[in-house]
């Protein structure tokens, strides 16, 4: 069964006029790539490259296309049925807890750890302890900072932003 977006979640002033007659539960909805007219009678196409809708809906407006930020590359353009897909540039990644920006991947693992995962657009390099093989949780400093810290003194984590 197709997913659909209805006006129930919208503010009252954004809702379209009620349909006079619905011969099925979904009559009065418009297909993906469209929104409904103010009088609720017609379906109006989203504008290619400007806005979109992904599901059957009775929205008065299509959703605005995302513009990729600097530091991101456009994987696929916005169409009337699908939003733009943006991805972090090579050497940067987007964390789940800070999805608003791409952050620089670390250049290497701290002393005593080995790299088991590369930098990808959605994850930093992955480091594990040589002996135990357990993952290092949280941010760890890059190789250069580890090397410069005094023996016996743990290096403090630094926050790298893209």
């Amino acid at each position: 069964e197709s997913a659909l977006i209805t006006q129930q979640d919208l503010a009252p002033q954004q809702r379209a006029a009620p349909q006079q007659k619905r011969s099925s539960p979904s009559e009065g909805l418009c297909p993906p790539g469209h929104h409904i007219s103010e009088d609720g009678r017609d379906c109006i196409s989203c504008k290619y490259g400007q806005d979109y809708s992904t599901h059957w809906n009775d929205l008065l407006f299509c959703l605005r296309c995302t513009r990729c930020d600097s530091g991101e590359v456009e994987l696929s353009p916005c169409t009337t049925t699908r939003n733009t897909v943006c991805q972090c540039e090579e050497g940067t990644f987007r964390e789940e807890d800070s999805p608003e920006m791409c952050r620089k991947c670390r250049t290497g693992c701290p002393r005593g750890m080995v790299k088991v995962g590369d930098c990808t657009p959605w994850s930093d390099i992955e480091c594990v302890h040589k002996e135990s093989g357990t993952k290092h949780s949280g941010e760890v400093p890059a190789v250069e900072e580890t090397v410069t810290s005094s023996p016996g003194t743990p290096a403090s984590p630094c926050s790298l932003s893209g």
């Epitope: 069964e1 197709s2 659909l4 011969s23 099925s24 539960p25 979904s26 009559e27 909805l29 297909p31 993906p32 790539g33 469209h34 007219s37 017609d42 379906c43 109006i44 196409s45 504008k47 290619y48 059957w56 169409t79 009337t80 049925t81």
Partner: antibody, heavy 119, light 107 residues
Framework: QVQLVQSGAEVKKPGASVKVSCKAS????????LHWVRQAPGQGLEWMGW????????KYNEKFKDRVTITADKSTSTVYMELSSLRSEDTAVYYC????????????WGQGTLVTVSS | DIQMTQSPSFLSASVGDRVTITCRAS??????VAWYQQKPGKAPKLLIY???TRHTGVPDRFSGSGSGTDFTLTISSLQPEDVATYYC?????????FGGGTKLEIK
């Protein structure tokens, strides 16, 4: 390959009804919207309405709303268009056509069904 | 309803000619226009959508352009098999409407 196969030609008297069928094959029936478009002899094309099997959504052109009924039998992947209170100006070739759930252009068409209304 | 006015309604050209068919919408339809080719006794075939995107398998001699209210279908070098009637269609707002057609023949 995608095929839309329509029922055969019909001759009807004014005031009668006609029911034309369109059997779809070669794709997932519930993923595309099916439409009815008609063409009077020597004339242009006129969109009548759609049926979407994925959620049973139906939309009619207001011009035909009182006389047309579009239904479907999902078990046989068939869509039907019934036009009632026929008049001579309803003489036309009736096409079913499909479109993806996006922009409203038609990528595949049935072969057409000629409906002749004559007393 | 949006009216789609096609011109000319009849066109005669020679093989190899560049042929242009125009379509004017009665109101702004953005780029939501499709073009179809229909041969006698056959169903229409999709050529162009979104004003300028060629449908799969359509020869590259067919091209479309335009936005807003004025649209053009161009055949860069007319071939004998292009003899047909051509229709524009707006897919911007329901009811979707078609132009009256342009009948193209070879001189």
């Amino acid at each position: 390959q995608v095929q839309l196969v329509q029922s055969g030609a019909e001759v009807k008297k004014p005031g009668a009804s006609v029911k034309v069928s369109c059997k779809a094959s070669g794709y997932t029936f519930t993923e595309y919207i099916l439409h009815w478009v008609r063409q009077a002899p020597g004339q242009g094309l006129e969109w009548m309405g759609w049926f979407y099997p994925g959620n049973n959504n139906i939309k009619y052109n207001e011009k035909f709303k009182d006389r047309v009924t579009i239904t479907a039998d999902k078990s046989t992947s068939t869509v039907y268009m019934e036009l009632s209170s026929l008049r001579s100006e309803d003489t036309a070739v009736y096409y079913c056509a499909r479109h993806e759930q996006g922009p409203g252009y038609f990528d595949y068409w049935g072969q057409g069904t000629l409906v002749t209304v004559s007393s | 309803d949006i009216q789609m006015t096609q011109s000319p309604s009849f066109l005669s050209a020679s093989v190899g000619d560049r042929v242009t068919i125009t379509c004017r919408a009665s109101q702004d339809v953005n780029t939501a226009v499709a073009w179809y080719q229909q041969k006698p006794g056959k169903a229409p075939k999709l050529l162009i959508y979104w004003a300028s995107t060629r449908h799969t398998g359509v020869p590259d001699r067919f091209s479309g352009s335009g936005s807003g209210t004025d649209f053009t279908l161009t055949i860069s070098s007319l071939q004998p098999e292009d003899v047909a009637t051509y229709y524009c269609q707006q897919h911007y707002i329901t009811p979707w409407t078609f132009g009256g057609g342009t009948k193209l023949e070879i001189k």
